[in-house]
Each structure stands twice: as C-alpha cells, then as structure tokens.
C-alpha cells in the first residue's frame, strides 16, 4: 500500500484520516507525555560492567553541535521514566533465578545502565524531534533502497522475542543514506502502546504516535553486528511512525495476520517474503536524521537514526491487533514496549527538507536556525 505524500510545508503531517494536515492543537502532548530531561535518581552511581563488543577504547562520539560548550557533563539520559503513565509496567520481564543482569524490561528494575553501561551514555535514543529546531541539510539526499521487494520464497522468520515482534531479513537488502554510506538490512521490529495509549519511541514536539517501525541495518564496512556496535555509523535504523487511517494496510496485514501464531513469548513462525519497502512511507526524500543509540540494551551508541517525515497508515483494527495479541514473559501482555525519550545533550537533529518552515499554529514561536553538518563530515 502506498501512502499519499505530505504537503511540502507540513512536517510529519498525516492525521488519523490520512490527510495532509500537520499535527493540530488537539495533538499537543499532555504534561505526562512530555520529554523528560531530569535524571532518574541514583543512576549516576551505578557500578560499571565490562564494555560491549566494539566499544573498547573508543573516543566519545562528537555531538553534531557547533558549540560543544553547550554540553553539560552532569547531564545523564533518562533511562527509565516509571512515573510516566505512558510507560509500560512489568513487561518483558523474566523471573529467573540467579544474578542475571542481562535480563531487562521496560519501566522497572534492573536499571538499564546496570544491564549495559552504554545505556547511561550521553547520546541515547529515542529523542523528541522538534522540527523547528532541526537543521535543514540539503546534502541529505533521498534514501536509496535496493532489493527490498522480496519474493514469497524463501520464507522469513517472524518471532516474538518477549519485547517486540521481529522479522529477520535475508541477505541482499541494500540501503544507502548517501554516497559511500551503504548498509544492509538485518531485521525489522515494531514498538507499540496499548488500547488508547500510543507507543512510538520517538516523539514529535512531545506527541507520541500509536506505533513505530524500525528497520535495522549494518554498515557494509562491517561483517558482523558485534563488530559494528558502538562504532560511529556502524548501524543505521530507518524509523517510521504508524498512525490510524481509514483503510487496512495490506503490506502490514501480511505480518499482523500471523501474530496469533506467535502470541507466546519466544515463539516464531515462517512468513512468505514480502515487499519490505511497502512497510515504510513512500517519500524517501523527507526525513530527520541524528546520531543516537539502540533503544534497548545494550544501548550502543553511534547509531544513525533516520526518521521519516511521512507516516504510515494502519486501520484501527490493525493497530489493535498489534497491541493486543502478543504476550511477554510471566503472563504479561507485550504492550507499551517503548523507551522514554532521551536528552539531546547538544546534538542537533538534521532535516533533509526545510522542516522549520511550518504553517501550523506552532510556527508563531521563533525559529532557531541550527547549522547543518554535511553528511559524512
């Protein structure tokens, strides 16, 4: 299913009816939905653990900011926001004996930095995107995807891993963020909320969308994920927001119709190959980009995030199927599987289009023009 293109002057347009309007006043976040910048208590004092593969002796990734003085060393990212009613409770949690620091869950113990020290890094994901503050970067060209239209055979593995539903992708799906920035797709997974509660990871001006798709890619400069982890640009994720629309999305239905088969945590099924690009917005030219991290442990940094301006429409029934079918460990529903937004700590989000030019009511506020760092610099 191909989606209508959004208006040129409407960052992240597309309401529940699939129209071209930007987010209206009724979409403004409630207070508890706002990005949280405060530090969680006690996380500064967490014991360290062995570094993750590929992160040894690496210099700190430089933020995309002209003024490094704007970074405060005392700032730590918000790893958990248990007080946020939107945050999941008791999900993806394993009751296992023994000292197991590698289990993790959303919205509770153990604190993620104890699971992986990288989760306390300064340049974490997801983040709140403020189009008005994004730096327009003409060097950001349309994304190039090759080989994403898969034949029905061989079939692909669809798995409920306890904290998401994940589709493993075969070799041959190539993606370029620009000249010399080539990647191959590894897997895709989704993040969602619960009935009446949105569950995207990234937010836009504090607005959380119903769900979000992530397509994870490995740089062709690396043979393996563990070699690329923590290396700047080693991994790249394409992210798109999922919204409610009037019609069933036939591409997503190929996956959603199989979720009942993998309702149980740890279960998997085989699904026919499909057009992976049909799961993404049709406009590959308008997007936001920044350097962040994996949004789940090990939270490795150096990940290039590309968040589409255009959204993808699913029917209300499809969004309900996504959020109400799967189970995590311990007889808990797999819902609200998103991480709280993390502070930018001086990072500048770049836009491939002039996102600050906005006809919405919010355009009245002064626009801060951030400068663009040419891609690859």
């Amino acid at each position: 299913q191909r989606l209508p293109r959004m208006q040129e002057d409407s960052p992240l347009g597309g309401g529940s009816s699939g129209e071209d309007d930007p987010l209206g006043e009724e979409d403004l976040p409630s207070e508890e939905d706002s990005p949280r910048e405060e530090d969680p208590p006690g996380e500064e004092d967490l014991p360290g653990e062995e570094d993750l593969p590929g992160e040894e002796d690496l210099p700190e990734v430089k933020p995309k900011s002209e003024e490094e003085g704007s970074l405060k060393l005392e700032d730590l990212p918000t790893v958990e926001a248990p007080g946020d009613p939107q945050e999941p409770q008791n999900n993806a949690h394993r009751d296992k004996e023994g000292d197991d620091q590698s289990h993790w869950r959303y919205g509770g113990d153990p604190p993620w930095p104890r699971v992986s020290p990288a989760c306390a890094g300064r340049f974490q994901s997801p983040v709140d995107i403020r189009p008005q503050l994004a730096a327009f970067c003409p060097a950001l060209r349309p994304l190039e995807l090759l080989g994403f239209q898969l034949p029905p055979l061989p079939e692909l593995r669809l798995r409920n891993n306890g904290h998401s539903v994940q589709l493993t992708l075969p070799p041959g799906l190539e993606m370029a963020l620009g000249p010399g920035r080539e990647y191959r797709a590894l897997q895709l997974h989704l993040h969602w909320g619960a009935a009446g509660r949105p569950g995207s990871e990234h937010t836009v001006e504090g607005h959380r969308f119903p769900a979000e798709i992530h397509v994870v890619h490995l740089s062709t400069a690396f043979a393996r994920v563990d070699e690329a982890l923590g290396r700047p640009g080693g991994l790249a994720v394409l992210a798109a927001f999922l919204e409610e629309g009037p019609e069933e999305n036939s591409a997503y239905e190929q996956l959603l119709s199989r979720l009942e088969e993998i309702a149980e945590e740890g279960s998997e099924t085989q699904v026919p190959g499909l057009d992976i690009s049909a799961l993404l917005p049709s406009d590959f030219s308008r997007y936001f980009q920044y350097e962040g991290s994996l949004t789940t442990p090990p939270c490795a940094q150096g990940v290039i995030w590309t968040v589409f301006n255009q959204t993808v429409m699913l029917s209300a029934k499809q969004l309900h199927t996504l959020s109400d079918t799967l189970w995590g460990p311990g007889d808990s529903r797999l819902q609200l599987n998103f991480r709280a937004t993390q502070p930018l700590n001086g990072r500048v989000i770049e836009a491939s289009f002039p996102a600050g030019v906005d006809s919405s009511p919010r355009a009245a506020e002064p626009v801060q023009l951030n400068s663009c760092l040419a891609a690859g610099d």
């Epitope: 570094d51 394993r94 620091q101 590698s102 061989p154 593995r157 891993n161 306890g162 590894l186 090990p298």
Partner: antibody, heavy 122, light 107 residues
Framework: QVQLQESGPGLVKPSETLSLTCTVS????????WNWIRQPAGKGLEWVGR???????NYNPSLKSRVTMSVDTSKNQFSLKLSSVTAADTAVYYC????????????????WGQGTTVTVSS | EIVLTQSPGTLSLSPGERATLSCRAS???????LAWYQQKPGQAPRLLIY???SRATGIPDRFSGSGSGTDFTLTISRLEPEDFAVYYC????????FGGGTKVEIK
C-alpha cells in the same frame, strides 16, 4: 580474544545428573547466545541447547525433558545440567558462542571451548 | 525438526584437487542460518562459513559456500594438506541441527 573453558566432573554415574560449566574470558558474556554441543567418540556433532544471557533457552527436542541451562553474567559463566544420564550420554561436551543480540541474525558458532570428556559409568 | 544430510560420507582426494561437499535439508533453510565447520581429530570444530556464503574471520578464500533453499555446497577450490578433516553443515533455527559430516581424506 574471547576464550571458552569447560569444566566439570569427567565421570558421572548412571541415573545421576551431569553438571558442566563454561567460563567466558577475554570478553563479555552479555548479549550473546551460548550453546552446548556434544560428540560421542567417533560420531558426529549433536546440539544440546542454547541460552541467551536474558535466560531465554532453546533445547534439542530429544533432550528437552532432561536439560537445564543457566547463566551467571556476574561470573561470566553459563552452565548445563543433564539429568538421568545413561551410557549414551558419554561424549565430549563443547561450549560455543552463537549469535549476537536477540536479533535472529546468525553468524555461526564462532568461538568454541576445547571440550571436556564426560563418561557415564558406574 | 530439520534434518541435514551430507554427501558423500567420505571424499578421497589429492592435495591441489577441488573438493565439493553437499548438504541437503529436509525442508527449506534460510541462507541466513546455514553454516559450515571443519573439525580435525582431537580438536573442537572451527567455523568456516556462515550465512551460507560468508567466510568467517581468518578463513582462506579457497573455502566458499553457496546454495539456498534445501541444497547447499561447500567448495574447497584447491586442497591444502591441512584441509583434510571432517566437515559439518549446520542449520540454526528455533532448534539447531548438524549434518552427519563428510570426511575429506587423502587419496
């Protein structure tokens, strides 16, 4: 360089429980799958099972009722217990590192221990 | 459970010759989850190929893997003395299985 070392008793009596531990050195145990494989003398390789560092497990269906695996990330170790052993469980037992992250992306078992011989006999 | 059948059971060749080893699966296997190992007497197996065709770190380019679906092949373009060993294919899914092995011996 990651290295694996199996340890445990070399002799186990029939009907008892075989217990082995694999110690990971030179790298972190976290976020990998860890496998046990066995090989009877002069025969082929048989996969016993795997554990992810979250505690998630998959076992060989033919051994599932007798196998338990656990992981202790604080000690960089994972363990195998095989109950109600018989002479047919006599083999060299290997531990090996498998895929990274719960991403279902597979790179093969790229690091192996040297193996430990377990004999089941009274 | 996916059964992997390797053939031939034994391959008798001379150094410098080309070795072609076959692995057939009882049902379709994603290329992402097909690996090949080499094992010499008294040693642990060594990963040669993963993802059906990707060479593991440090593996010479005379080793190559190919195939998809149910038929996979390991090719050693020019046998060196140290290549005489037993070779196993392996599939990795929710359960893992190994083939029975092919012994490559000196003719």
């Amino acid at each position: 360089q990651v290295q694996l070392q199996e340890s445990g008793p070399g002799l186990v009596k029939p009907s008892e429980t075989l217990s082995l531990t694999c110690t990971v050195s030179g790298g972190s145990i976290s976020f990998y799958y860890w496998n046990w494989i066995r090989q009877p003398a002069g025969k082929g390789l048989e996969w016993v099972g795997r554990i992810y560092t979250s505690g998630s497990t998959n076992y060989n269906p033919s051994l599932k009722s007798r196998v338990t695996m656990s992981v202790d990330t604080s000690k960089n170790q994972f363990s195998l217990k095989l109950s109600s052993v018989t002479a047919a469980d006599t083999a060299v037992y290997y531990c090996a590192r498998g895929g990274f992250l719960e991403w279902d992306y597979y790179y093969g078992m790229d690091v192996w221990g040297q193996g430990t011989t377990v004999t089941v006999s009274s | 459970e996916i059964v992997l059948t390797q053939s031939p059971g034994t391959l008798s060749l001379s150094p410098g010759e080309r070795a072609t080893l076959s692995c057939r699966a009882s049902q379709s296997v994603s290329v992402t989850y097909l690996a090949w190992y080499q094992q010499k007497p008294g040693q642990a197996p060594r990963l040669l190929i993963y993802g059906a065709s990707s060479r593991a770190t440090g593996i010479p380019d005379r080793f190559s893997g190919s195939g998809s679906g149910t038929d996979f092949t390991l090719t050693i373009s020019r046998l060196e003395p140290e290549d005489f060993a037993v070779y196993y294919c392996q599939q990795y899914g929710s359960s893992v299985t190994f083939g029975g092995g092919t012994k490559v011996e000196i003719k």
